[in-house]
Interface confidence: low
């Protein structure tokens, strides 16, 4: 089948890193500098992504794969394939259109990215506040008075932080 296909379409024999050059009798030519083809049988090579400005190169472009960028310190990636760099804020802040702003009372952010989230409402679980919340930390819920019996656990650990690298888009 491969041989049949290649007789019909000579370009199908061109491997990744090359392109099928119509100007040269459909022979497989290497991708020019700063371009790549990640699959075989391509009729053109793609221009490599360039990591400039706030972007920095995480992986150099090769003839078979695009460059990959990340962000300079003080910024973090957003979007598919780090298509944008967003400014970091301090813990206890969130990024708004006017820059980094402190979390409002009753909310917190324990990361350098993402939004301020409301403190846990301990009373919804019938618990009391053991440790007050801050701009940087959620409240710690403790047992309700009825739970304070010998052998009962004294502290419920706070909810785990959001997985690194994920924040509301």
């Amino acid at each position: 089948f491969e041989r049949t296909r290649s007789l019909q379409d000579p370009c199908s024999n061109c491997p990744a890193g090359t392109f099928c050059d119509n100007n040269r009798n459909q022979i497989c030519s290497p991708c020019p500098p700063n371009s790549f083809s990640s699959a075989g049988g391509q009729r053109t090579c793609d221009i490599c992504r360039q990591c400039k400005g706030v972007f920095r190169t995480r992986k150099e472009c090769s003839s078979t794969s695009n460059a990959e960028c990340d962000c300079t310190p003080g910024f973090h990636c957003l979007g598919a394939g780090c298509s944008m760099c967003e400014q970091d804020c301090k813990q206890g802040q969130e990024l708004t259109k006017k820059g980094c702003k402190d979390c409002c009372f009753g909310t917190f952010n324990d990361q350098k990215r993402g939004i301020c989230r409301p403190w846990t409402n301990c009373s919804l679980d019938g618990k009391s506040v053991l440790v007050n919340g801050t701009k940087e930390r959620d409240v710690v819920c403790g047992p309700s008075p009825a739970d304070l019996s010998p052998g009962a656990s004294s502290v419920t650990p706070p909810a785990p932080a959001r997985e690194p690298g994920h924040s509301p888009q």
Epitope: S38, T44, C45, R49, K52
Partner: nanobody, 122 residues
Framework: QVQLVESGGGLVQPGGSLRLSCAAS????????MSWVRQAPGKGLEWVSH????????DYAESVKGRFTISRDNAKNSLYLQMNSLRAEDTAVYYC???????????????WGQGTLVTVSS
């Protein structure tokens, strides 16, 4: 001079489909990555999708993945966005944008079209 002209917008019911087109002129279309970007009423710009110069590398925003398909025809200097299973939240002005050649594969744009309005409503 560089020109990008979108067409194909209109009113469509939820669940319906539309195909947007963008006619490019004034530059070597086949050398540039191209994007679709949208702006919902009263909201900021949202990147939707982009396609590499040859069309072999494509990416989508999570909000449209599986519903929208970007494509290009370099012989016709045209970019397309096929939009299926449309939702009310897809209502926006859709812009075709040329990606800045210094920042290929990013959401950095140097030229924009005038936009075409897509309204999804029953």
């Amino acid at each position: 001079q560089v020109q990008l002209v979108e067409s194909g917008g209109g009113l469509v019911q939820p669940g319906g489909s539309l195909r947007l087109s963008c006619a490019a002129s004034g530059f070597t279309f086949s050398s540039y990555w191209m994007s679709w970007v949208r702006q919902a009423p009263g909201k900021g710009l949202e990147w939707v999708s982009h396609i590499s110069s040859s069309g072999s590398t494509i990416d989508y925003a999570e909000s449209v993945k599986g519903r929208f398909t970007i494509s290009r025809d370099n012989a016709k200097n045209s970019l397309y966005l096929q939009m299926n299973s449309l939702r009310a939240e897809d209502t926006a002005v859709y812009y075709c944008a040329r990606e800045d050649p210094r920042m290929t594969g990013t959401t950095d744009f140097d030229y924009w079209g005038q936009g075409t309005l897509v309204t999804v409503s029953s």
